[in-house]
Interface confidence: low
Amino acid sequence: AITEAREEAKPYPLFPGPFPGSLQTDHTPLLSLPHASGYQPALMFSPTQPGRPHTGNVAIPQVTSVESKPLPPLAFKHTVGHIILSEHKGVKFNCSISVPNIYQDTTISWWKDGKELLGAHHAITQFYPDDEVTAIIASFSITSVQRSDNGSYICKMKINNEEIVSDPIYIEVQGLPHFTKQPESMNVTRNTAFNLTCQAVGPPEPVNIFWVQNSSRVNEQPEKSPSVLTVPGLTEMAVFSCEAHNDKGLTVSKGVQINIKAIPSPPTEVSIRNSTAHSILISWVPGFDGYSPFRNCSIQVKEADPLSNGSVMIFNTSALPHLYQIKQLQALANYSIGVSCMNEIGWSAVSPWILASTTEGAPSVAPLNVTVFLNESSDNVDIRWMKPPTKQQDGELVGYRISHVWQSAGISKELLEEVGQNGSRARISVQVHNATCTVRIAAVTRGGVGPFSDPVKIFIPAHGWVDYAPSSTPAPGNADPVLII
């Protein structure tokens, strides 16, 4: 039998007919053993249904009376077989059995889908003793059924080492469709087909699916769940959802946005994080990614000097971490910097250009044509040189540093001299005779001391020698300084 539980259904009477033997007419149990506190349910199903052969387990008692007549087989009485009801409704169903009084300590347990129901379920067992038999009613109630209550319920009773099992009572909880798969937001290429999936289940089945695009139904005829919607392509963003219908009503999925991939917006807020003589560290805030992940970025650098040839240097880098150190720049120079980033669709426009300057650096080259000669008459060494090229000074020249090392048998002595920026010659006193003097010169800016020139050596003889020939830095290509004595 299938019974559909409806809101207006009246509860069945607990005992539609008397049990064997004489029970009190008001059917008040003499003993009631609740397993857990119960509630008054909305529905209750009668423990007996006449006229159907029994299919549950039967126990044949071995004990006989004085007359040796065998006792009748023990079995649960028939009950409702299938209960259909809506979610959140209450339900109560029963198992009943009459047990001869010779059996003591009989207990009934409830099982669902093969597992015993323990703990705080609303199960109550009532005992109605008579002269020969005790009628036992086991009631099970659920105050507000959920889908998880769906299943097959049975009663079990252990008696004489035998297990008696009732017919199953199938509970079917029906409700609005329940989504097991909803459409998901996607970012798609313009005019490219894509699929959306929607799946919902009952009971009751079947569940029919309607697709909705921007609040308009896509399919006039519903499709059975699950449904796959193939969208041939979009030219602008759209919102899709699906409606799941069954006999209980309608459930609507979350609306999902399908975005059209586009080129990214240009980066914003390009800023200078640090500046040195030959590098600039920049950062930027990426623009909107156009619904497609950034792949990489390009930093464009051009000299801001109006007299420059306008060529653009391009540095490619990964999209993260929105930070890049631009190297190989000139010192004390002005640059315009822009950033562009790309995704799978293409390159963004360039960010607004920003101006940046490199700082003053130490010179990158040494003074040129260093020449050293001995002025014996005044006991001095004269040193001459040429300024490094202006572009390689990397800042405003503030002077020169001269290193001269004096070496003779067993001693070595290094001295440093500072010379103002305007000079291109210097004179140092002879420190030791009969010794070699090694001279090196470096240019100095506020950014620091540049590299020293290659060493130039001159021999300082003992008093009385004459030597007017200078020593000088080698011509390009020679491996060692030339020593002329």
Partner: antibody, heavy 120, light 108 residues
């Protein structure tokens, strides 16, 4: 009929938190988003975010990220909005509003509003 | 974020007059995503027009809406005293959802 009933007015000190509730009735609570919108005294409307009660999915306005948490209790059809680290400029009327489900995206029913005053 | 700018901020009008409020968006919005609300003093906002031109349930027919792209208009034909309120436009095109700054309508 659809109704959204909000909790009563609150007075808080700067740095404290406030939790406003919004009880829905008259429709299936899990089918529609609950949005939170605030209105400072004499000012316009500012969207704070939404929550989808069916699965707790939230979308917050970046301006409030890290300070706001939206939750729901489907058993009582109630939505909650908690705002932390309150400042005086959080003084406003906070509204819950039902968001039409398909993201087109409008607010078809509003709560009566909860006044939150932040003052030392 | 999409910025909505309403015009005018304030308008004082006599009953039976026709009133036009405009709302300009900082980027193009499909008309499906554009809505109007009415907020009377000390009340919650109320949905007035959805999807540019569809009247919400219970809204009198003297209200109408139109527009496309970036420019949208709310029109009240033959203004009545009960229409004194602040009117807000709103876009549902992208998060964050945004409102116009509001237009306050006063009845002379």
């Amino acid at each position: 009929q659809v109704q959204l009933v909000q909790s009563g007015a609150e007075v808080k000190k700067p740095g404290a938190s406030v939790k406003v509730s919004c009880k829905a009735s008259g429709y299936t609570f899990t089918t529609y988003d609950i949005n939170w919108v605030r209105q400072a005294p004499g000012q316009g409307l500012e969207w704070m975010g939404w929550i989808y009660p069916r699965d707790g999915y939230t979308k917050y306005n970046e301006k409030f990220k890290g300070r706001v948490t939206m939750t729901t209790d489907t058993s009582t059809s109630t939505a909650y909005m908690e705002l932390r680290s309150l400042r005086s400029d959080d003084t406003a009327v906070y509204y819950c509003a039902r968001g039409y489900y398909d993201n087109l995206y409008y607010f078809d029913y509003w709560g009566q509003g909860t006044t939150v005053t932040v003052s030392s | 974020e999409i910025v909505l700018t309403q015009s005018p901020d304030f308008q004082s009008v006599t009953p039976k007059e026709k009133v036009t409020i405009t709302c300009s968006a900082s980027s193009i919005i499909s008309s499906n995503y554009f809505h109007w609300y009415q907020q009377k003093p000390d009340q919650s906002p109320k949905l007035l027009i959805k999807r540019t031109s569809n009247l919400a349930s219970g809204v009198p027919s003297r209200f109408s809406g139109s527009g496309s792209g970036t420019d949208y208009t709310l029109t009240i034909n033959s203004l009545e005293a009960e229409d004194a309120a602040t009117y807000y436009c709103q876009q549902g095109r992208s998060v964050p959802l945004t409102f116009g700054q509001g237009t306050k309508l006063e009845i002379k």
